[in-house]
Amino acid sequence: SGLNDIFEAQKIEWHELPRWRQQWSGSGTTSRFPETVLARCVKYTEVHPEMRHVDCQSVWDAFKGAFISKYPCNITEEDYQPLVKLGTQTVPCNKTLLWSRIKDLAHQFTQVQRDMFTLEDMLLGYLADDLTWCGEFNTFEINYQSCPDWRKDCSNNPVSVFWKTVSRRFAETACGVVHVMLNGSRSKIFDKNSTFGSVEVHNLQPEKVQALEAWVIHGGREDSRDLCQDPTIKELESIISKRNIRFFCKNIYRPDKFLQCVKNPEDSSCLSGI
């Protein structure tokens, strides 16, 4: 980006830039960020008994240590390793649900199907879900005014690197049959540039993952097309098959009925297709 070019060309240190330079294109850190992370950690460890040994103050310290005082366009996955270590957690085989561009439905599903887990149902994903954060180089301050935008400023920003790091780890630890929910209303049902397409797909371990099953969620009520035949789904199938992982695909024509049938599987209307 332009700011990085200035940085490189002039060989100046970040802290020598005037204060007004530290303006980014993205929104600033979510208000009450430290309090929110700490409260979420306490609540999570409360309801997930196997995580009750976790010291939430240490989690916050590790989270803070990943980005505070660091140039917010030069964050690395290494910066998050202390946090990742503290948040180590495993998902039972066959219980991992990945998603791409359809977060709300994926989360509604795991809120009902309590034995399946998205990344945001794990401690680290739960802590950071829907939050933004960044610091400032050489100060201990959190920047509540602005943070780097992935497109306009830089990709190695605190939020993007966090999600890349934890998504990689989540995919690496998955086993059995892994499910992914995809948005059938988008032009690219499978997008190679999404976190799923660029990180998770490539970090599923063939020696542990037998199959990837895609659930393509239809948007229109009258949409009866077989979206499993979409070219981007075929592309996903090719990528997965080359990695020696079997691929399956299902159309979910009625997401509302799908959720209702997860809630009440004995309902007679659930015996027909969804």
Epitope: V42, K43, E46, V47, H48, P49, E50, R52, P92, K95, Q111, Q113, R114, D115, F117, D121
Partner: antibody, heavy 121, light 110 residues
Framework: QSLEESGGDLVKPGASLTLTCTAS?????????ICWVRQAPGKGLEWIAC???????TYYASWAKGRFTISKTSSTTVTLQMTSLTAADTATYFC???????????????WGPGTLVTVSS | AQVLTQTPSPVSAAVGGTVTINCQAS????????LAWFQQKPGQPPKLLIY???TLASGVPSRFKGSGSGTQFTLTISEVQSDDAATYYC??????????FGGGTEVVVK
Amino acid sequence: QSLEESGGDLVKPGASLTLTCTASGFSFSSRYWICWVRQAPGKGLEWIACIVAGTTNTYYASWAKGRFTISKTSSTTVTLQMTSLTAADTATYFCAGDPRTGSNVGYFNLWGPGTLVTVSS
Amino acid sequence: AQVLTQTPSPVSAAVGGTVTINCQASQSVYNNNYLAWFQQKPGQPPKLLIYSASTLASGVPSRFKGSGSGTQFTLTISEVQSDDAATYYCQAYYSGGIYAFGGGTEVVVK
């Protein structure tokens, strides 16, 4: 260590009622979960809600959200507020504790004797 | 949405015999083993028998045995005594602070 419920009564449909659970011989530690479970006459047990003593975070059965409110009022008391009562809410209401210590997690090891709520016109 | 189905009900047993009660969960319980068994007699609150699927609660006779994992659990009462006549409930814990009870199984001792 014991729990005891109070506040059960005969009320008319549409009425509200508050039940109280009181701990004797101990106070709720920060990790202690205090919960309410009910049992309609001749029927099975039904979980309603829990509150965590240390954080006052609350957890409800999906059917109980909105009409039932669980609150911690002191280090030894928890209440359950019930609104818009119907005949279907007629039951014995039990207070139960999930200690959340060591391996004691996810089940109720301490129960009160129960208090009867009757909703009838 | 978290449904625990107990079978059979009622079940009858002769003194000295064996009773087996099944509890099937519609979803895997937390950690595959967060399941407890309770005994309840008329006019009394439930009494904890088994927790963590197979651990015997304090003071409970070893005639009571819990087994199972994930979605299928069993309570076995061997050498049944007349005092074992009661209703038995399974209770599960799920991720997110959710508890659920089975519908109960009445044990009649002949």
